[in-house]
C-alpha cells in the first residue's frame, strides 16, 4: 500500500481542516488508514482522524481543531496499521479556504432596487470576520450568456443593484462566495443559490 498523491490540506480558520490524498489502488480509507495530527506546541497530544473514501483510491479526512491562530503548525502522520506511509506538516494560516457565506436572500420590495444580503460565516471573535470580501454571481436561468459577477470589496455582507440592470420578467439565480486577502486565501465554495423573478416598472418613454 502506497500513497500516490500526498495529502494536501486546507483550513477554514475556525474549527476544521480538510486533508485529501490518493492511494495507489482502491482503499477502504476508514478501516485501513489513520491520519494522526499534532499541534507543534508544548504538551500537545496526537489526535486521530478517521478518513472517508473520496472516490475509489481517494481519501479525505476532516481534522477537528479547537481554533486556529497564525503561528499554529501541525505534524501529520498517515498510518496503515503499524506502517507509516507518509509524514508531513501543515500550517493552517498558509492554506485557508474560508467557509461559504450563508442565508443569501434577495429583497425585491425596495423600489426598483434589488438588495442581496447574506451572512458572514464566521463569529465576530474570529480573525476572518472582519477580513472577508465577497463575489456575487447572478445568472439567468433562461439565458446562459446572461451571467455576471459583482465584487463586494467592503465588509458589509450585502449588495444593491438596480433591478433595471437585469432583464425584466425572467427568473434569476444568485450565489455568493468569500475570500480574505490578508491570508491570501482561496475562494470559498459558493453558497447555495437563491432564485427570484425579476420584474420592475419600465419607465414611460417620452416622445
Amino acid at each position: 500500500m502506497k500513497v500516490l498523491q500526498e495529502p494536501t490540506c486546507v483550513s477554514d480558520y475556525m474549527s476544521i481542516s480538510t486533508c485529501e490524498w490518493k492511494m495507489n489502488g482502491p482503499t477502504n480509507c476508514s478501516t485501513e488508514l489513520r491520519l494522526l495530527y499534532q499541534l507543534v506546541f508544548l504538551l500537545s497530544e496526537a489526535h486521530t482522524c478517521i478518513p472517508e473514501n473520496n472516490g475509489g483510491a481517494g481519501c479525505v479526512c476532516h481534522l477537528l481543531m479547537d481554533d486556529v491562530v497564525s503561528a499554529d503548525n501541525y505534524t501529520l502522520d498517515l498510518w496503515a496499521g503499524q506502517q507509516l506511509l507518509w509524514k508531513g506538516s501543515f500550517k493552517p494560516s498558509e492554506h485557508v479556504k474560508p467557509r461559504a457565506p450563508g442565508n443569501l436572500t434577495v429583497h425585491t420590495n425596495v423600489s426598483d432596487t434589488l438588495l442581496l444580503t447574506w451572512s458572514n460565516p464566521y463569529p465576530p471573535d474570529n480573525y476572518l470576520y472582519n477580513h472577508l470580501t465577497y463575489a456575487v454571481n447572478i445568472w439567468s436561468e433562461n439565458d446562459p450568456a446572461d451571467f455576471r459577477i459583482y465584487n463586494v470589496t467592503y465588509l458589509e455582507p450585502s449588495l444593491r443593484i438596480a433591478a433595471s440592470t437585469l432583464k425584466s420578467g425572467i427568473s434569476y439565480r444568485a450565489r455568493v462566495r468569500a475570500w480574505a486577502q490578508c491570508y491570501n486565501t482561496t475562494w470559498s465554495e459558493w453558497s447555495p443559490s437563491t432564485k427570484w423573478h425579476n420584474s420592475y416598472r419600465e419607465p414611460f418613454e417620452q416622445h
Epitope: L42, D66, A71
Partner: antibody, heavy 125, light 112 residues
Framework: EVQLVESGGGLEQPGGSLRLSCAGS????????MTWVRQAPGKGLEWVSS????????YYADSVKGRFTISRDNSKNTLYLQMNSLRAEDTAVYYC??????????????????WGQGTTVTVSS | DIVMTQSPLSLPVTPGEPASISCRSS???????????LDWYLQKSGQSPQLLIY???NRASGVPDRFSGSGSGTDFTLKISRVEAEDVGFYYC?????????FGQGTKLEIK
Amino acid sequence: EVQLVESGGGLEQPGGSLRLSCAGSGFTFRDYAMTWVRQAPGKGLEWVSSISGSGSTTYYADSVKGRFTISRDNSKNTLYLQMNSLRAEDTAVYYCAKDRLTASVRPIYVGLDVWGQGTTVTVSS
Amino acid sequence: DIVMTQSPLSLPVTPGEPASISCRSSQSLLYSEGYNYLDWYLQKSGQSPQLLIYLASNRASGVPDRFSGSGSGTDFTLKISRVEAEDVGFYYCMQTLKTPYTFGQGTKLEIK
C-alpha cells in the same frame, strides 16, 4: 473540590532514591498535563518536570535530567516523580500543579491553577 | 533558556495604596495573537503558590479584581489597585511558553 495531595517526601542520603506521589481529585485527571515545581529553603520557585495528559510527552529541567522520571497512572488519578541519584541540592519542598488541558487539540492553558500542599525532601548524610 | 527578571525585588506599600511589579523576559512570550504565556503567582508565608493571572492579563477564578495584569511580548506588569494586608507575600512571574518553565526571582511585598 479540585485538590492535589502530595506524599512520599522524607530524609534520604546522597545517591539515594525517593518516589513522590500526587493524588488528584475533583477533575478529569487524564485530560490535564501535570507539573512538578520545587522550592529550596529560602529560595524561589524552580520548575522540575511536566507530563502531558496521556503521559506520552515529558519534559525535564537540565538539573534533574537523567536522574528524575515523571510518570502518571490515570487509572489511579496519580502523578509520580521518581528521584534517583539524589544530591544535596535536591533538598526542597516539592509541589505538584495542574497544568494545561491536553485533551483538546490546542492545549488550553489557564495557568497552574491548582497546587498541592507540598512535600519536603531532604538530602543529607 | 528564557530568563525572567522582576523588579523591584522588595516592595513596601501602605495599605490602600497601589502597587506595581514589572517582569521582563529575555525572549518574546507571545505565541500568537492573544497568547502571551506569562503568569503571576502569589506565595504567602508557609503556603503553596496560588495563581493570580494567566496568559498575561486573565484573572484566575476567585482572584479579587484589584489585581490586574498587562503587557505583551517581553514586558509585563502586575498591578494591585489598592493593597490590603492580606496581599503580603512573594510575587512571582513565570513563563510557560517553552521548557524549561522559568520564574522571576520573586518580589517581596510588605506592608509599611
